[in-house]
């Protein structure tokens, strides 16, 4: 059995040239004639040179999975899905996203170091000593309150709580 060159496909014991992206095989090659190709029908595509008898169905962006259509399908390119605002892609296969997850909310004691995007989760960072954060979408940790000369420090601040000063 012959091994076909790249961008050829095997038909019986003959190698036929593949069809261009956006096309599929309508009629395989013969002794004196090459491969006859046909354009992909609407809502189908082929992204590469191929020996397919049918084009591939275009992907559908499922809103229930947190997806929206970013780029419509064309005869040579699959639909490109993106996550809705506030979500990032958990499963990325090339340019195709199948599931989205909600951006992480930074816990108390951490701040947002890098905001989440459609393809990356939020990156959180610990507050430095002397600062605190209640978490959420805070991008800066706040410095602990310095109790005034007329106040007494009841409880020292932590990375998630401010200093508690006496009211006297």
């Amino acid at each position: 059995q012959p091994s076909c060159r790249q961008e050829e496909f095997l038909v019986g014991d003959e190698c036929c040239p593949m069809c261009n992206p956006g096309y599929h095989v309508k009629q395989v090659c013969s002794e004196h004639t090459g491969t006859v190709c046909a354009p992909c029908p609407p809502q189908t595509y082929t992204a590469h040179a191929n020996g397919l008898s049918k084009c591939l169905p275009c992907g559908v962006c499922d809103p229930d999975m947190g997806l929206l259509t970013w780029q419509e399908c064309s005869s040579w390119k699959d639909t490109v899905c993106r996550c809705i605002p506030g979500y990032f892609c958990e499963n990325q296969d090339g340019s195709h996203c199948s599931t989205c997850l909600q951006h992480t909310t930074c816990p108390p004691g951490q701040r947002v170091e890098k905001r989440g995007t459609h393809d990356q989760d939020t990156v959180c960072a610990d507050c430095l000593t002397g600062t605190f954060s209640l978490g959420g979408t805070q991008e800066e940790c706040l410095p602990w309150t310095n109790c005034s000369a007329f106040q007494q420090e009841v409880r020292r601040g932590t990375n998630s709580t401010d200093t508690t000063c006496s009211s006297q």
């Epitope: 060159r5 593949m18 261009n20 090659c29 004639t33 090459g34 491969t35 006859v36």
Partner: antibody, heavy 121, light 108 residues
Framework: EVQLLESGGGLVQPGGSLRLSCAAS????????MSWVRQAPGKGLEWVSL????????YYADSVKGRFTISHDNSKNTLYLQMNSLRAEDTAVYYC??????????????WGQGTLVTVSS | EIVLTQSPGTLSLSPGERATLSCRAS??????LAWYQQKPGQAPRLLIY???TLSSGIPDRFSGSGSGTDFTLTISRLEPEDFAVYYC??????????FGQGTKVEIK
Amino acid sequence: EVQLLESGGGLVQPGGSLRLSCAASGFTFSTNYMSWVRQAPGKGLEWVSLISYSGSNKYYADSVKGRFTISHDNSKNTLYLQMNSLRAEDTAVYYCARGRGNTISGTFDLWGQGTLVTVSS
Amino acid sequence: EIVLTQSPGTLSLSPGERATLSCRASRSVGKYLAWYQQKPGQAPRLLIYSASTLSSGIPDRFSGSGSGTDFTLTISRLEPEDFAVYYCQQYGSSPPITFGQGTKVEIK
């Protein structure tokens, strides 16, 4: 004698229309795939369109899709190319050619002498 | 689409010399490549199909070789009537049918 004879070329304004004809003789027209191939002045060959003997399969180059229409009349042994919305870049000698192998994926074994189409204002 | 690149653009030779013309495809077209000859003011004429099969009535000083992406047209001994423009055409995967930009064989 086996031959192809084109006619219908001429000067036309941009946006105008023209209909080319190709009369075949000496062979059975109704059993051959027929094509139009053009050649801009001083340039190379560019395939334009092809029709199957039954007329059910028609193919077009992207550059003419939606503007040109290929057809034939087997009883008159004649191939046609209706050209609408003509542009300056459509200026060329248009050849009628017979396909060998009866498929779009074949070669051209018989050519007409060509007819000149000039698109200019 | 499959792009065909012919080289050289012009070939200057004397009658009796050997001419070697090249045609390279942007991807494999198998053996489905044809060569045409065109003289000034005339229509093209089919010389070779299936990369190496001589069309009827074509003298055997013309020969073709190659497969996949690299093809060659050879004229073993140039006759005065062979000075012309030569085009390659792929029909491995259509539509579209594509031609090379041509090689001019001129008298040196």
